[in-house]
Structure formats: C-alpha cells, structure tokens
C-alpha cells in the first residue's frame, strides 16, 4: 500500500481543516488508514482522524483543530496499521479556504432598490472577520445569458443595486462567496442561493 498523491490540506481558519490524498489502488480509507495530527505547541496533544473514502482510491479527512492563529504549524502522519506511509506538516494560515457566507436575504421593499444582505461566517474575534470581501452572483432562471457578478470590496456584508438593472417580471437567484486577500485565500464555496421575483415600476415616459 502506497500513497500516490500526497495529502494536501485547506483550513477554514477557524476549527476545521480538510486533507485529501490518493492511494495507489482501491482502499477502504476508514478501516485501513489513520491520519495523526498534532499542533507544534507545548500544550498540545496528538489527535487521530479517521478518513472517509473520496472515490475509489481517494481519501478525505476532516481535522478538528484549536482556534487557528497565524503561527500555527501541524505535523501530519499517515499510518496504515503499524506502517508509516507519509509524514508531513501543514500551516493552516498558508492554505485557507474561508467558510461560505450564510443567511443570504433579498430585501425588495426598498423603493426600486434591491438590498442583498448576508452573514459573515466568522465570529468577531476571528482574524478573518474584518478581512473578508465578497462576490455576489445574480442570474436569471429564465435566461442563462443573464448572469452577473458584483464584487463587494468593502467590509459590510451587503449589496444595493437598482432593481431596474435587472429585467422586470422575471425570477432571479443570488448567491455569495467570500475570500480574504490578507492570506491570499481561495474563494469559499457559494452560499445557498435565494430566489425572488423582480418587479419595479417603469418610470413614466414624458412627451
């Protein structure tokens, strides 16, 4: 039994890191393998992650971690019984995939303005709380070509757009994702989408 693709890990910069790897053949990850991990820290202890299958030869492990700080470094040991298959390390701050924003809501009761709000996925004491920027994706269910992205580069988790920038009388969906420039993160997953019917009063034509 050998490792074909070494484990690569990403952290949510809060409490979970996800590691994925591939073996050289079909493997029952949960019965045959164990991933041991430990924070390099005077008061830390070793933890064991039981991997799950991720395709025939692929394995994935969800590591529960202490609250992350930038200096953290974890040792990783992949075992098959008594055999050490791979040894490595992982700095969560260097491989961050933020959590997805939540509670996306479209407020349509503001005069001809759409107000989209969502929740920051981090608590205020987390470093990423004040460093997230967002991308909002809005698309028409009726017209695949009517697909747009709004970049929200300020900290407030909201976006205002004129309802008239979208077509009236049809349904739209929106979703939002996040990233943090400070740690050069990847984009988060998209939030669940929310749907609304776009309608607004056309301005009276004056002759």
């Amino acid at each position: 039994m050998k490792v074909l693709q070494e484990p690569t890990c990403v952290s949510d910069y809060m409490s979970i890191s996800t590691c994925e790897w591939k073996m050289n053949g079909p493997t029952n990850c949960s019965t045959e393998l164990r991933l041991l991990y430990q924070l390099v820290f005077l008061l830390s202890e070793a933890h064991t992650c039981i991997p799950e299958n991720n395709g025939g030869a692929g394995c994935v492990c969800h590591l529960l971690m202490d609250d992350v700080v930038s200096a953290d470094n974890y040792t990783l040991d992949l075992w098959a019984g008594q055999q050490l298959l791979w040894k490595g390390s992982f700095k969560p701050s260097e491989h961050v995939k933020p959590r997805a924003p939540g509670n996306l809501t479209v407020h349509t009761n503001v005069s001809d303005t759409l107000l989209l709000t969502w929740s920051n996925p981090y608590p205020p004491d987390n470093y990423l709380y004040n460093h997230l920027t967002y991308a909002v994706n809005i698309w028409s269910e009726n017209d695949p070509a009517d697909f747009r992205i709004y970049n929200v580069t300020y900290l407030e988790p909201s976006l205002r757009i004129a309802a008239s920038t979208l077509k009236s009388g049809i349904s739209y969906r929106a979703r939002v994702r996040a990233w943090a420039q400070c740690y050069n993160t990847t984009w988060s997953e998209w939030s669940p989408s929310t749907k609304w019917h776009n309608s607004y009063r056309e301005p009276f034509e004056q002759h």
């Epitope: 005077l42 008061l43 953290d72 608590p123």
Partner: antibody, heavy 115, light 109 residues
C-alpha cells in the same frame, strides 16, 4: 465580544490556599489554550501556568508542585488552585486566552499573602 | 530558560517624539513567537504586536515592531499622550515556555 471575568482573589495567610476562577464568554472556550499570568506590586509580568485544549498543563518553576491549573469546558471556566502560598506569591493574577502570545486578558484579581 | 532584557528601563520623552524600545533575548527567538504589550496603571496588558512585526487588531499604525534572532525593537513613531505607559516584550519557546521582559516605562519628559 470576548470577555474573561475573574473572581476568587483575597487575603490569605502564608501556607494557606486560594482558588481563582475565570469565566470566558464570546468565544469557543473549548478550542482555546488558557493561561494565568501574575504581576507582583510594582513589578513586571510573570507567566504562571497554561492549559491546552486537551488538558495538557505547564507551570513556571516558581509555582510547580504548589499550583494546579484546570478547566471546565462545560462551564467555560478556568481555575487556579493555589496551595502553600508564600509572601512572594502576592500579586495581581490575570487569566488570559491565547497560545504563543496573549490577545485577551481578564481584569485581574489581587491575591494578598500576609500574616 | 530564555531571558528577555529590555532597555532602557525608563524612557523620558515628549509627545510627538519618536520612541524606540529594545528587547534582547539570551538566545535566538523565533520571530513568529515574539510579542509586545502596553500596560497602563490599574489595567490589564494590551497586545500591540505579535509575530515581531504584525499589529494586533485596533492598534494604531504609529506602533511598529521589527527585529529577528536575539534583537527586537518596538517603535512608536509619534508619541500621543495616551502612549505613556509600560511596555513589555514576551516570547514563546516550544521547550522553555513563555517569558516576559522586565518592562520599559515611557514617561513624559
């Protein structure tokens, strides 16, 4: 908002015992190492003890064998049991949340050791 | 045990002046684990700098940290009235644990 609220200080005779408490809120207590740091009157800061998320502990040589740090994650609380207290243990004791450094501190509680 | 020695013991300056505080370690310290704190009378310490040079959230940019190995510096570019306080450096070591310097008092001249 992160808060660390301390209690349990007071006056104790040399050789006596005292238990300090620190209640945490506004963060996930169980995922954080916790510490005690003290400051004798007019002196500098001295690290006393720390406890990891899994219960691993460490102590400054000056208190080893006399002080015991513990935590109750269900109550979001940190404790310091101080036995065989000496005059040189008299200080303001702070609880702190952190790891390699301490971004969050309690308000401090004064421990007076005097006969 | 790693010993941190701060100098000077007291720094007498006027508002608007530049303050340079030194912290010297008895052996090499990882920059990742070097921090600076400010403490005012009757208050708990406040983290200013971590990782030798990163400002903690909410700390004004007049505070900066630098250094590596055994020599570290905290600089306050222009002293404000609220900056007069005692400053401590602190280090963490995987075997020796946590230690503080003895402090530098920045007082009004």
């Amino acid at each position: 908002e992160v808060q660390l609220v301390q209690s349990g200080g007071g006056l104790v005779h040399p050789g006596g015992s005292l238990r300090l408490s620190c209640a945490g809120s506004g963060f996930t207590f169980s995922r954080n190492a916790m510490f005690w740091v003290r400051q004798a009157p007019g002196k500098g800061l001295e690290w006393v003890s720390g406890i990891g998320t899994g219960g691993a502990t460490n102590y400054a040589d000056s208190v080893k064998g006399r002080f015991t740090i513990s935590r109750d994650n269900a109550k979001n609380s940190l404790y310091l049991q101080m036995n065989s207290l000496r005059a040189e243990d008299m200080a303001v004791y702070y609880c702190a949340r952190g790891r390699y450094y301490f971004p969050w501190w309690g308000q401090g509680t004064l421990v007076t050791v005097s006969s | 045990e790693i010993v941190l020695t701060q100098s000077p013991g007291t720094l007498s300056l006027s508002p608007g002046e530049r303050a340079t505080l030194s912290c010297r370690a008895s052996q090499s310290v990882s920059s990742s684990y070097l921090a600076w704190y400010q403490q005012k009378p009757g208050q708990a310490p406040r983290l200013l700098i971590f990782g030798a040079s990163s400002r903690a959230p909410g700390i004004p940019d007049r505070f900066s940290g630098s250094g590596s190995g055994t020599d570290f510096t905290l600089t306050i570019s222009r002293l404000e009235p609220e900056d007069f306080a005692v400053y401590y450096c602190q280090q963490y070591d995987h075997s020796a644990g946590w230690t503080f310097g003895q402090g530098t008092k920045v007082e009004i001249k």
